[in-house]
């Protein structure tokens, strides 16, 4: 699994790079699964999409997402994993030209086709949690995380730091 050690590896990479803002520090392909090991599958067509959160069949290939890692341009007092008070942020893309977006009004996670530079809604602060898990906090709405609700991805408000370990906002990243 790509958890604590992986996040630390890319956090360390910040020291070796002066790149900030619109250029990613590094990119990484990984399958995304929930804390309970349900797979996340992205079913995109030109005019529609669906994101499945479910137990994947044994013989089926896991979808992968391209995670692009960025260093936040602005120092932060938030709890995001980073270096020198800066946060590590990611964008998540399941296929070329499409990215996960936070729709804070609808509390939903959406897929949008867009060109770079990506809007702020496509950026998530990466948190390195326990048990080799990570969580994704909306850049546009601190305290709101990508989570699982009714077998779908949704935006979930986390009231206190104690709730940061709630299972429905924890995800696993794996190379396989």
């Amino acid at each position: 699994a790509f958890g604590i050690s992986g996040v630390q590896k890319y956090t360390r990479a910040l020291h070796d790079s002066s790149i900030t803002g619109i250029s990613p520090i590094t990119e990484y392909l990984a399958s995304l699964s929930t804390y309970n090991d349900q797979s996340i599958t992205f079913a995109l067509e030109d005019e529609s999409y669906e994101i499945y959160v479910e137990d994947l069949k044994k013989d089926e290939k896991k979808d992968k997402v391209l995670l692009s890692y960025y260093e936040s341009q602005h120092p932060s007092n938030e709890s995001g994993d980073g270096v020198d008070g800066k946060m590590l942020m990611v964008t998540l893309s399941p296929t070329k030209d499409f990215w996960l977006h936070a729709n804070n009004k609808e509390h939903s996670v959406e897929l949008h086709k867009c060109e770079k530079p990506l809007p702020d809604q496509a950026f998530f602060v990466l948190h390195n949690m326990h048990s080799n898990c990570v969580s994704f906090e909306c850049k546009t709405d601190p305290g709101v995380f990508i989570g699982v609700k009714d077998n779908h991805l949704a935006l979930i408000k986390v009231d206190s730091s104690e709730n940061l370990c709630t299972e429905n906002i924890l995800f696993k990243l794996s190379e396989t």
Partner: antibody, heavy 126, light 106 residues
């Protein structure tokens, strides 16, 4: 509206060659894996070959390996099937089919064949 | 190579339920799809991912898959449902189809 239009079929002698084309429209062609599926007269469907995003991601059924070559030209929204060393048992209607979903970074073909062309007939006979 | 086995034919009276089976080793570990093909026409996807219907496919078509068998069920069968039906799976980036089942509406 998704449209797939095959062409290039015809009568060819055993050992001969044919090149089939499939012109695609109504969707972002480069985003989808594509396949060729054939159907011999009075028989069932048989998957022939598939292609994902580039020339390295090609897949073939055992009966056509080494004889058929699948390719695509994303600038022309066209899928191809080059068929060499044709045999009588290759006689069939050849359908071009698009994967239901866009390709994912995991690579390979994706789920079922969501859209089909009308087919082009290939007859191998002396 | 992976083999999917279907009954050659199934007969059903109008309004009744037709069930078509598709058997393969550990079929339930794969996602099954079903295609309808009417004479002289191209195949049409009617079920994918075991149970899901593409837009435009009537609700009377449903699917299930467990163990070694996937099943396509047509509830309240109509005359227009008379066709050949093929199951299919994707196995290691290779397409596999069953031999097809001719559904006759009596």
């Amino acid at each position: 509206e998704v449209q797939l239009l095959e062409s290039g079929g015809g009568l060819v002698q055993p050992g001969g060659s044919l090149r089939l084309s499939c012109a695609a429209s109504g969707f972002t062609f480069s985003s989808y894996a594509m396949s060729w599926v054939r159907q011999a007269p009075g028989k069932g469907l048989e998957w022939v070959s598939g292609i994902a995003d580039d020339f390295t991601s090609t897949y073939y059924a055992d009966p056509v390996k080494g004889r058929f070559t699948i390719s695509r030209d994303n600038s022309k929204n066209t899928l191809y099937l080059q068929m060499n060393s044709l045999r009588a048992e290759d006689t069939a209607v050849y359908y071009c089919a698009r994967d239901l979903w866009m390709m994912n970074y995991a690579g390979g073909l994706r789920y079922p064949f969501g859209y089909w062309g009308q087919g082009t007939t290939v007859t191998v006979s002396s | 190579s992976y083999v999917l086995t279907q009954p050659p034919s199934v007969s059903v009276s109008p309004g009744q339920t037709a069930s078509i089976t598709c058997s393969g080793e550990r079929m339930g570990d794969k996602y099954a799809a079903w295609y309808q093909q009417k004479p002289g026409q191209s195949p049409v996807l009617v079920i994918y991912r075991d149970t899901k219907r593409p837009s435009g496919i009537p609700e009377r078509f449903s699917g299930s898959n467990s163990g070694n068998t996937a099943t396509l069920t047509i509830s309240g069968t109509q005359a227009i449902d008379e066709a050949d039906y093929y199951c299919g799976v994707l196995k290691q980036d290779t397409g596999v189809f069953g031999g097809g089942t001719k559904v006759t509406v009596l």
